[in-house]
């Protein structure tokens, strides 16, 4: 808390600008208006403020927005964004794309903080589901955004904001999220055809039935074999041999290096080895 | 519901054989999604996987000591058994048996039975 | 083989604290990581399968992240039936390799 003191004569400010610098924290707090502020806060980012002096003007904003701070504020917040707490954030109403955007770029390049990850949530939460446009702009942001929500969570993507996925940003996605993705996947591609759709699907193949890899081994798309490997293991353990090389095409020859690890091992062992055989890789049941 | 109950020896002399069993009940060892594993924990020390056979009669041991184990299945008694030959103090431990399903990992464990190796 | 490394080795904490122990694998296991407890003279017990997936019957303070090489488990408020030991294995590779343990003890 600064201590209340009068602002000394000639001091008030009557525009937010780069003298302000050099008024100590106590002269900030008694002689910048906090209306003031609210109406130029896109000034203050210009202008280089110590720490100690954002405190100061934070609280300013604390004190005239005790419910939280109106959009037209936040907007502009810039470096000051780095000063709000979680529960500050919790307090405001932010609805505007652009106004989300602004604020992921003061914390760009750096990971994902409790204060970003209060802003999204509260961002998302507001507009009721992740529409294309917010999945767009939180994934060039956070690559991983995605995999960072609870299935829970991801049940709230529309299909058509799956488009908006690029592969990597299933990277750390782990089975139960691609359970949630792949129908929504499945729906959004439906209409490609077979090469173009298989292009678009394998990223999300983690969350793929049985039935779905028998009806991708009959088109001779050749899946290689880091997504087979991301495949889930109820999913693969009814396929044949047959069916398997079908899937995998060329690459299946790749089975013999992977065939100490999942989901390669459990279906070798639940095969015939006379089936195995047909294969010729020397994979032993 | 499946319960694991492991027999055998208590005491061992050393380059002798050690041999336990375990039952299997409530359950059947051919199981399609379950693997049959031993594990074992020497005093004040951590877990060590043994290894593991399918009811068709696969094996897959860990590699330190696959020279010197057998698992092996009995589908008609529901069993399966561990033999670990030319024992040391070194293999002194809790031996237990464990399930291992497919979608899960170790879901049920026997309680442990303890085995000395002294002459 | 692929190691697994635990962290730490023992850990001391009051009721009501949030604890988190860490398990790191020599090298890639996709979400292949379970996590077990054991008390003095019992059998472990499974608690977190496929790295985040909680085991039938275990409450929901447990809970597991990760995926790769580095693997997080959390209780979110330790209870005092919770002080045992824990630990990660993995049973991506056929050697089924587990971590040291980590102790959780009453501080």
């Known amino acids: 808390e600064v201590e209340k003191t009068a602002c000394p004569s000639g001091k008030k400010a009557r525009e937010i600008d780069e003298s302000l610098i050099f008024y100590k924290k106590w002269e900030l707090e008694a002689c910048v208006d906090a209306a003031l502020l609210a109406t130029q806060m896109d000034r203050v980012n210009a202008i280089p403020f110590t720490y100690e002096q954002l405190d100061v003007l934070k609280h300013k904003l604390d004190e005239l927005y005790p419910q939280g701070y109106p959009e037209s504020v936040i907007q502009h917040l810039g470096y000051l964004f780095l000063k709000m707490s979680p529960e500050d954030i919790r307090k405001w109403n932010v609805t505007s794309l652009e106004t989300l955007k602004a604020l992921l770029e003061v914390n760009k390049g750096h990971e994902m903080s409790p204060q970003v990850a209060t802003l999204i949530d509260r961002f998302v939460k507001g507009r009721g589901q992740l529409d294309k446009d917010t999945l767009d702009t939180l994934t060039a942001f956070y690559p991983g955004y995605l995999c960072s929500l609870s299935p829970e969570e991801l049940s709230s993507v529309p299909p058509s904001s799956i488009w908006a996925v690029r592969p990597q940003d299933l990277d750390t996605c782990d089975p139960r999220q691609l359970d949630v993705l792949y129908p929504k996947a499945r729906l959004a591609f439906q209409n490609m055809n077979g090469s173009e759709y298989f292009v678009k699907i394998q990223s999300f193949l983690g969350g793929a039935p049985t039935e779905d890899l028998k009806a991708l081994s009959q088109q001779n798309v050749s899946m290689d074999l880091a997504t087979f490997m991301k495949l889930r293991t109820d999913a693969v353990l009814p396929l044949t041999v047959a069916e398997v090389q079908k899937l995998l095409g060329p690459h299946v020859e790749g089975l013999k290096a992977e065939e100490r690890h999942r989901p390669v091992r459990d279906w070798i062992l639940r095969q015939r080895q006379d089936d195995l055989d047909t294969l010729g890789l020397g994979l032993q049941g | 519901q499946v319960q694991l109950q492991e027999s055998g020896p208590g005491l061992v002399k050393p380059s002798e054989t050690l041999s336990l069993t375990c039952t299997v009940s409530?359950?059947?060892?051919?199981?399609?999604?379950?693997?049959w594993s031993w594990i074992r924990q020497p005093p004040g020390k951590g877990l060590e996987w043994i290894g593991y056979?399918?009811?068709?009669?696969?094996?897959n041991y860990n590699p330190s000591l696959k020279s010197r184990v057998t698992i092996s299945v009995d589908t008609s008694k529901n069993q399966f058994s561990l033999k670990l030959s030319s024992v040391t103090a070194a293999d002194t431990a809790v031996y237990y048996c464990?399930?291992?399903?497919?979608?899960?990992?170790?879901?049920?464990w026997g309680q442990g039975t303890m085995v000395t190796v002294s002459s | 083989d692929i190691q697994m490394t635990q962290s730490p080795s023992s850990l001391s904490a009051s009721v009501g604290d949030r604890v988190t122990i860490t398990c790191r694998a020599s090298?890639?296991?996709?979400?292949?990581l379970n996590w077990y407890q054991q008390k003095p003279g019992k059998a472990p017990k499974l608690l977190i399968y496929?790295?985040?997936s909680l085991q039938s019957g275990v409450p929901s303070r447990f809970s597991g992240s990760g995926s790769g090489t580095d693997f997080t488990l959390t209780i979110s408020s330790l209870q005092p039936e919770d002080f045992a030991t824990y630990y990660c294995?993995?049973?991506?590779?056929?050697?089924?390799?587990f971590g040291g343990g980590t102790k959780v003890e009453i501080k």
């Open positions: 464990a399930r291992d399903n497919v979608f899960t990992g170790f879901d049920i």
């Open positions: 294995q993995q049973p991506y590779d056929a050697s089924y390799t």
């Open positions: 056979i399918y009811y068709s009669g696969s094996t």
């Open positions: 090298q890639s296991i996709s979400s292949y």
């Open positions: 409530g359950g059947s060892v051919s199981s399609y999604h379950d693997l």
């Open positions: 496929a790295a985040s």
